[in-house]
Structure formats: structure tokens, C-alpha cells
């Protein structure tokens, strides 16, 4: 029997009955075996077919078979009910081989010309399957010449059988306190030949609870326990399962913080799988009872491991852990069922004892010693000699723990000394002056350094004086011996003050005239104000109306008297202001250089002489009474004059203080 071509030769060709196109002889049997390469099939069709027709093609026939299967038995010229002729049909091998057998019997009633057929190898499309047949590949099928291959969707891997897609469903770890997990593709059928492992791993102290939800469908067997597909649940304590079938398993309270779920499937079946909703529980902590005047947030039915709550206090109450104040408070439930921190208290805010007010006092309004939230205190200044600056002295204990004024200030009020108070009612003299009485010039300051000089107290820690009087001590302020509250220059009974710093006007030039002859001394401590020590006022803007020509000012000091000695007792003199042009003219003639009297000076004295300030009075104040406020203010500072004090036609020259108010205010506010 002739064999057809064998692969790897090119597989195509022609077959024909013996003697074709002539008639074929009786008793012929011819067999062709065609073989195509793997992954290919053979296609065969007839271009001519003329064989004796017989019932079921028993006499003459062409038989096509592939492996053990007969594809067709052919005879005649055209098909009948019981016989088949090829006509225009194309025949395909089932695999890569095709057997063709031709046979004729012992006789023919008439001549038959036989057949002619052509064949060729062609690629099999393994990816195309007949309806109802199992697909070639689980997921994706890829045909190519001579074969095919399968591939899988993301999350799957090709099984070693090269067709099935096994799910990549292991190594998933669930760490949240609750969640859901299900079989791959749920609720669609789960994959074959898969082994899935899921882990639930919670912090120690939690216990996992498993609930099967919705539906459960895992391949089962009527007699054997889950031999095909199964679900198992493992904890460190015990194993649950295996589970299969269609009944939802009951809730599983694992009493464990770690759970491993294993799901194994075989190569067959079409089942939807399972879905688990897991939750967790833990030993609850005692229910947090809010302390009085506080509240708990968030409010929960119960608090378990990792749950927390915060305490918030009502306005005016603060969080205290015993004696320890807390900015905030949050407690966390621990695995042993205890809170990690003790419950605090909401204690009423206590502002504490109010600070002492220098030169003042404090009074408890709400009640003796009451310093808690909304308590009221009243500060007041020592009467007569001090007055409260800016606020009314009423302070309330606010929620932030600070005593706060009605204007919202948290700083203490200030008791400012009352200025310009004097016991004196009428006038007298210094050079040609009169003895001062106690309380007449309580601002008077005696300055002892290289020489004797004077000054005037401003506020309770500044002294106003002449620049020339303290020039030598400007770099050694501590050398100044400052005394106040006494009338007698040599008395041992006085209030001592010491200088912290000396500020000489930057426009003053020593030994080159007396322009800008003004200085400030800052004391290193505040002095206590009383009837004998009271500051002088600085002039108001309107003060010039009390310092016109012929208005009376008063100078005081321990300077030279008519007898030529420093006064033992504080002396004073009332002198009128002199017209500025008249004074300028008086000091234009020699020995005085032109321009000695400047706009920063004022003059006072009598044309006839006899009343004047003198050496030793330098730096002292020339004061005037403000009749509107009934307070004394400093209009001038004893600066210079004629060599012979009280000389007729000459006048005492004083630094004009009103010109220096900005300078004084700047120094005092800066230092």
C-alpha cells in the first residue's frame, strides 16, 4: 500500500484511483497514509468522483479515517439517503494523520472512472471548540502555526497542565479590625486547581469573629467529607472545617488574634464559593464616667482594645491629673482591659493669689481669698500720693488662669505717683529768699557729687536736672549721692537714692554755653512717695499760658545765699518771668558772648535784683502753679546767670523745659 508523504516534507499533493482518468479495474485496493506535522491537520477534497453505487457503499468505496475514527465512506456520484458521495465537501483529519482507502469489488456493471483528490496540511486552530465542548484554555487561548498556548488574567498563574489558570490567592494579610474576604471571583465560579491562603493578623488582645455571609457553594461529595474542594480555618488554638457544600457554616468565634484560612480547589466543577465578613472584639475597658464639669468624647456603647476617649472640661475648668495640669487628655484601652491613663479631674481654674501692686493694694470682692474662675478682685492705689494709670483696677479670674482687667489686660495696673502736690500756699525767696517748710517742695532733690547741685523728682524713679550739674559724673553715675525728703542739707535724716544712669542732652556742649542744659538721672530703685517726697509735673501743652512775662515762678535750693554760703535749710524765692528780648539784651554786653540766651531758655528775676537762684541751686526746678489742675509743674531748670547773683539788670537763666518734653518722654519710655 503506497504511503503518502511524511512530514517534514511539504505536505500537499494529489491522489487518484488506479488508471485515472481511465476506468479503474476490479479487485483493486489502494491505501494512502498522510501525515502532517504536529499541530497541523490534513484537508482533502475531490475534484472528480465516479464510483459504483451500492447499498451502504459495500461494493466499491473510498474510506477516509483519522486514527480509529472513520470520517466518511464514499461511493456513487451523488449522495442518496443511505450513501454518500463527496460532492464539493472538504474533509479534515482529526489529528495530524489521514488514512485514505480505495477498494473495488470483483465486478462493475458499467465502467467507472474513479476519483481524483487533492490534499494539503493546514494549521489547526485549537482555540476554536465546538459548542458544548470544554474550552481549550481556562482564560486566554492563543493559536499559532503548529500549535497554541494558554495565558491567564492578572492574579492567576498557568498550572503545570498548561491549560488551567490557578488563582494567585496566597499571602494576603488582613490587619484591620474588621473586613471581608472571599473566594477568588466570588460570586462567579472560583478557579480550578488553586490553593489559597488568607491571614487575619490583629494586635495581641483582639479576638477574631468570622461570619459566613450571602451564599456558600463549594464542591462536595455525598459520601466523603470534602474530597474535591474545601475551606479550612486554622488558629493557634484549633482547626475549623473542612467546609464544603451549599450550607452557610455557623459563626466562628476564634478567641485568637491570628487566623489562617485555606481554600483548595481541584480541576473540575463550577461553584460560586464563599464570602466571610470578619470582625474583632477584645476585653472591654471600664466605661469612662466623665468627671464633674467635664464630658467624654466620643461616646460609645463600649470601649475595647485601641479604642480611645478624650475628656473636655467646661469653660472655667481645667484638666488636672491630681496636681498636674494637662493640656489635653486622651486615654487608650489596653489589651488587659484597663485604660492606659487615670481619669483626670476637671477642676475649677484657679488664678492663684494676685500679685502685689507696688504702691497699691488688692481687695477680694467675691470672697476672702477666693481666686477661682470668675472671682473678682479690686486693685487700688495708695490714696493721695498715687493714682491708677489706664484701667479701673477691677480684675476677673478668666478661664485661661490669668487675672484679667475689663480691657482684657493681663498685666498689673500701674500706680503712678501724683505729681505737683505741695503744702505751700504763698511765696518767698532764696537769694533774698525764705526758708521752705516741710511739704513745700517735695520734688526737691539734693545732688552731691563733685559739687552741690539740685534736681526735681519726676515720677518715682527719675530726676530732672541741669546737664552742667552732672556732666562730670555722666560716665560714673554711681558716684552721684542723691538725697530727698529733707529740708536740711546736712541732716542725717533723708531718703537715699542712687543713680543707675545719667542721660545728658545730646545738644549740650560743656564749657561752650548753656544751650540744651538739661539731663535726666534714672534711679536704680523707685522711691516711696509721701508728703515729703512727691514728683513735680511736666508742663502740659497749655502750660505756656501760665508762663507769660511777669507770671510768677518759684525756685528752690540750698545754693549760696546773700551771706555767701550754701544754705543749711532749703530756701525758695518767687520770681517773675522776664521778657525774652529784655533778657537777651541784658546778656549781649561783655563779658557775655553774643547769643548766650537762646530760644531754649527762659529768664526770671527782678530788674532791681535781689531775688535770684545762685551757685548750688543748679539743676533745681523753677515751678509754676497750673491753676486749672491746681498742680505745680516744672517750667525751668536752674542753669546760669550773672557772676553776682541777684544783680540789678541781670536775670537768672533757666532751661525752658516745655521745649524738651519729647526728649524727656523718649528717654523715660526707652529706659
Amino acid at each position: 500500500t503506497p504511503l503518502g508523504p511524511k512530514w517534514p516534507e511539504p505536505v500537499f499533493g494529489r491522489l487518484a484511483s488506479p488508471g485515472f482518468p481511465g476506468e479503474y479495474a476490479n479487485d483493486q485496493e489502494r491505501r494512502w497514509t498522510l501525515t502532517a506535522p504536529p499541530g497541523y491537520r490534513l484537508r482533502l477534497y475531490f475534484t472528480h468522483f465516479d464510483l459504483e453505487l451500492s447499498h451502504l457503499c459495500e461494493y466499491d468505496f473510498v474510506k477516509l479515517s483519522s486514527g480509529a475514527k472513520v470520517l466518511a465512506t464514499l461511493c456513487g456520484q451523488e449522495s442518496t439517503d443511505t450513501e454518500r458521495a463527496p460532492g464539493k465537501d472538504t474533509f479534515y483529519s482529526l489529528g495530524s494523520s489521514l488514512d485514505i482507502t480505495f477498494r473495488s469489488d470483483y465486478s462493475n456493471e458499467k465502467p467507472f472512472t474513479g476519483f481524483e483528490a487533492f490534499y494539503a496540511a493546514e494549521d489547526i486552530d485549537e482555540c476554536q471548540v465546538a459548542p458544548g465542548e470544554a474550552p481549550t484554555c481556562d482564560h486566554h487561548c492563543h493559536n499559532h502555526l503548529g500549535g497554541f498556548y494558554c495565558s491567564c488574567r492578572a492574579g492567576y498563574v498557568l498550572h503545570r497542565n498548561k491549560r488551567t489558570c490557578s488563582a494567585l490567592c496566597s499571602g494576603q494579610v488582613f490587619t484591620q479590625r474588621s473586613g471581608e474576604l472571599s473566594s477568588p471571583e466570588y460570586p462567579r465560579p472560583y478557579p480550578k486547581l488553586s490553593s489559597c491562603t488568607y491571614s487575619i493578623s490583629l494586635e495581641e488582645g483582639f479576638s477574631v469573629i468570622l461570619d459566613f455571609v450571602e451564599s456558600f457553594d463549594v464542591e462536595t461529595h455525598p459520601e466523603t467529607l470534602c474530597p474535591y474542594d474545601f475551606l479550612k480555618i486554622q488558629t493557634d488554638r484549633e482547626e475549623h472545617g473542612p467546609f464544603c457544600g451549599k450550607t452557610l457554616p455557623h459563626r466562628i468565634e476564634t478567641k485568637s488574634n491570628t487566623v489562617t484560612i485555606t481554600f483548595v480547589t481541584d480541576e473540575s466543577g463550577d461553584h460560586t464559593g464563599w464570602k466571610i465578613h470578619y470582625t474583632s472584639t477584645a476585653q472591654p475597658c471600664p466605661y469612662p464616667m466623665a468627671p464633674p464639669n467635664g464630658h467624654v468624647s466620643p461616646v460609645q456603647a463600649k470601649y475595647i482594645l485601641k479604642d480611645s476617649f478624650s475628656i473636655f472640661c467646661e469653660t472655667g475648668y481645667e484638666l488636672l491629673q491630681g496636681h498636674l495640669p494637662l493640656k489635653s487628655f486622651t486615654a487608650v484601652c489596653q489589651k488587659d482591659g484597663s485604660w492606659d491613663r487615670p481619669m483626670p479631674a476637671c477642676s475649677i481654674v484657679d488664678c492663684g493669689p494676685p500679685d502685689d501692686l507696688p504702691s497699691g493694694r488688692v481687695e477680694y470682692i467675691t470672697g476672702p481669698g477666693v481666686t477661682t474662675y470668675k472671682a473678682v478682685i479690686q486693685y487700688s492705689c495708695e490714696e493721695t500720693f498715687y493714682t491708677m494709670k489706664v484701667n479701673d483696677g477691677k480684675y476677673v479670674c478668666e478661664a485661661d488662669g490669668f487675672w484679667t482687667s475689663s480691657k482684657g489686660e493681663k498685666s498689673l495696673p500701674v500706680c503712678e505717683p501724683v505729681c505737683g502736690l505741695s503744702a505751700r500756699t504763698t511765696g518767698g525767696r532764696i537769694y533774698g529768699g525764705q526758708k521752705a517748710k516741710p511739704g513745700d517742695f517735695p520734688w526737691q532733690v539734693l545732688i552731691l557729687g563733685g559739687t552741690t547741685a539740685a534736681g526735681a523728682l519726676l515720677y518715682d524713679n527719675w530726676v530732672l536736672t541741669a546737664a552742667h550739674a552732672v556732666y562730670e559724673q555722666k560716665h560714673d553715675a554711681s558716684a552721684l549721692d542723691i538725697r530727698m525728703g529733707t529740708l536740711k542739707r546736712l541732716s542725717p535724716h533723708y531718703t537715699q537714692a542712687w543713680s543707675e544712669a545719667v542721660f545728658i542732652h545730646e545738644g549740650y556742649t560743656h564749657d561752650a554755653g548753656f544751650d540744651n542744659d538739661i539731663a535726666l538721672i534714672k534711679l536704680n530703685n523707685k522711691v516711696v512717695i509721701n508728703s515729703n517726697i512727691t514728683p513735680i509735673c511736666l508742663p502740659r501743652k497749655e502750660a505756656e499760658s501760665f508762663m507769660r512775662t511777669d507770671d510768677i515762678g518759684t525756685a528752690s535750693g540750698w545754693g549760696l545765699t546773700q551771706r555767701g554760703f550754701l544754705a543749711r535749710n532749703l530756701m525758695y524765692v518767687d520770681i517773675p518771668i522776664v521778657d525774652h528780648q529784655k533778657c537777651t539784651a541784658a546778656y549781649e554786653k561783655p563779658p557775655y558772648p553774643r547769643g548766650s540766651v537762646t530760644a531754649n531758655m527762659l529768664c526770671a528775676g527782678l530788674e532791681s535784683g535781689g531775688k535770684d537762684s545762685c551757685r548750688g541751686d543748679s539743676g533745681g526746678a523753677l515751678v509754676f502753679l497750673d491753676s486749672e489742675t491746681e498742680r505745680w509743674f516744672v517750667g525751668g531748670i536752674v542753669s546760669w546767670g550773672s557772676m553776682n547773683c541777684g544783680e540789678a539788670g541781670q536775670y537768672g537763666v533757666y532751661t525752658k523745659v516745655i521745649n524738651y518734653i519729647p526728649w524727656i518722654e523718649n528717654i523715660i519710655s526707652d529706659f
Epitope: M289, A290, P291, P292, L320, G322, H323, L324, P325, K327, P342, M343, P344, A345, S347, D350
Partner: antibody
Framework: QVQLQQSGPELVKPGASVKISCKAS????????INWVKQRPGQGLEWVGW????????YYNEKFKGKATLTVDTSSSTAYMLLSSLTSEDSAVYFC???????????WGQGTLVTVSA | DVVMTQTPLTLSVTIGQPASISCKSS???????????LNWLLQRPGQSPKRLIY???KLDSGVPDRFTGSGSGADFTLKISRVEAEDLGVYYC?????????FGTGTKLEIK
């Protein structure tokens, strides 16, 4: 004035429990913490824990967790300390002390002697 | 826990003479509000402890001003300017900044 009156001495057997009391007077009981302090014979002082009667919230030194249980009865202004599973190591004088904003120990009770002996 | 170390263990002083006790903590006792919660207690023989000083240097009412407390951070001192007979007993420092509160080892003051 603030007073803390403690219960009398106790002689107890090993393994037993004992509950000692501290009755407060002279102030609002629910406003201040009560501390408990242990002093073994001839030894120093150890803070056991405290309780705030205003919220019935107790806090323990880790060393005394499971050994001491602090409670209060606000109706009688009394604080209690229950000592359980007693051993000879628990033989000591136990003091209660009332705290305030200045700290936990401005006011002290007179002490309760607990002796554990078979 | 914060460890409180007191020195000396015993102090023998003549009446009228000064005395000084040191207390060191294993960590700073400064609290977040800027205050340092360190107390000194005196336990006279057979009595309950009595607080002498709180917040490092504040004297409790009725405590004589011969007692002074000082220090900061982790280093503290109790000084008695002139010891009197009633001062004998055991002195304890105690920190109340950190939980649990911890006491010093104690210093026994004896009268010579």
C-alpha cells in the same frame, strides 16, 4: 480642718484578703485625690496608687496592679484599699494621703498596720 | 520608673548647726508647665510622714523658715540652717512629676 482617719491594725493569714479604710473629713470628699502609700517595717515609702472620688477613677503603680484595689464610698466619705492574695511581703504600714493642687501628699492619715502571718 | 537617690543615708548633727541633704533623680523632674514637682517629707519616729516642702522650694504652712529647698532638673538639696531637737527623723524626697511617684531612699537625721 482636713482629717484622714484610718482603720485599725489587721492580722491576716497568707492567701487571704484585707480591706482597710480611710475616712475623710473637713473638706469636700469628691474634690480631691486619695493616695495610698506602703511602708514596710524599717523601710522606705512606696506609692501604691490613687483614686479620684469625683469619678471613681483609680490609677495604680504597675507594681501593685492585681495586688491592690482602690474604691470609695462617697456617701460616707471613705476610701478603701483591698489587698488580696496576701504574703509576708505585704506586711507593712499603709498610709492614705489626700492630694491637692500643690501635690499628692500634703495631708496624711495615721497609717494602718497589716501583718500577714500563719 | 524614676529612681531617687538620697545622700547621705545618715546625718549626725549638733543642735544649732546646719544640715544639708542631697537628692538626685534619674531624669529631669521639670513638668511641661515649667514647674518642678519635687517634695521633701519628714517622718518623725512612730509618726506619719509630714510634708515640709513642695515645688522644690515652697514651704508648707507651719514649717519653720530654717528649712530651705533648692535645685532644678534632677539635682535637689534640703538645707536646715540651724538644727533643732524636733528636726530628728527620716527625711524623704519624693518626685511627683512622673508616674508612678517615687520616693528617695531616706536620710536619717540624728542629734549628736
Amino acid at each position: 480642718q482636713v482629717q484622714l482617719q484610718q482603720s485599725g491594725p489587721e492580722l491576716v493569714k497568707p492567701g487571704a484578703s484585707v480591706k482597710i479604710s480611710c475616712k475623710a473629713s473637713g473638706y469636700t470628699f469628691t474634690d480631691y485625690y486619695i493616695n495610698w502609700v506602703k511602708q514596710r517595717p524599717g523601710q522606705g515609702l512606696e506609692w501604691v496608687g490613687w483614686i479620684f472620688p469625683g469619678s471613681d477613677s483609680a490609677y495604680y503603680n504597675e507594681k501593685f496592679k492585681g495586688k491592690a484595689t482602690l474604691t470609695v464610698d462617697t456617701s460616707s466619705s471613705t476610701a478603701y484599699m483591698l489587698l488580696s492574695s496576701l504574703t509576708s511581703e505585704d506586711s507593712a504600714v499603709y498610709f492614705c494621703a489626700r492630694g491637692d493642687r500643690s501635690g499628692p501628699f500634703p495631708y496624711w492619715g495615721q497609717g494602718t498596720l497589716v501583718t500577714v502571718s500563719a | 520608673d524614676v529612681v531617687m537617690t538620697q545622700t547621705p543615708l545618715t546625718l549626725s548633727v549638733t543642735i544649732g548647726q546646719p544640715a544639708s541633704i542631697s537628692c538626685k533623680s534619674s531624669q529631669s523632674l521639670l513638668y511641661s508647665n515649667g514647674k518642678t514637682y519635687l517634695n521633701w517629707l519628714l517622718q518623725r519616729p512612730g509618726q506619719s510622714p509630714k510634708r515640709l516642702i513642695y515645688l522644690v522650694s515652697k514651704l508648707d504652712s507651719g514649717v519653720p523658715d530654717r528649712f530651705t529647698g533648692s535645685g532644678s532638673g534632677a539635682d535637689f538639696t534640703l538645707k536646715i540652717s540651724r538644727v533643732e531637737a524636733e528636726d530628728l527623723g527620716v527625711y524623704y524626697c519624693v518626685q511627683v512629676t512622673h508616674f508612678p511617684f517615687t520616693f528617695g531612699t531616706g536620710t536619717k537625721l540624728e542629734i549628736k
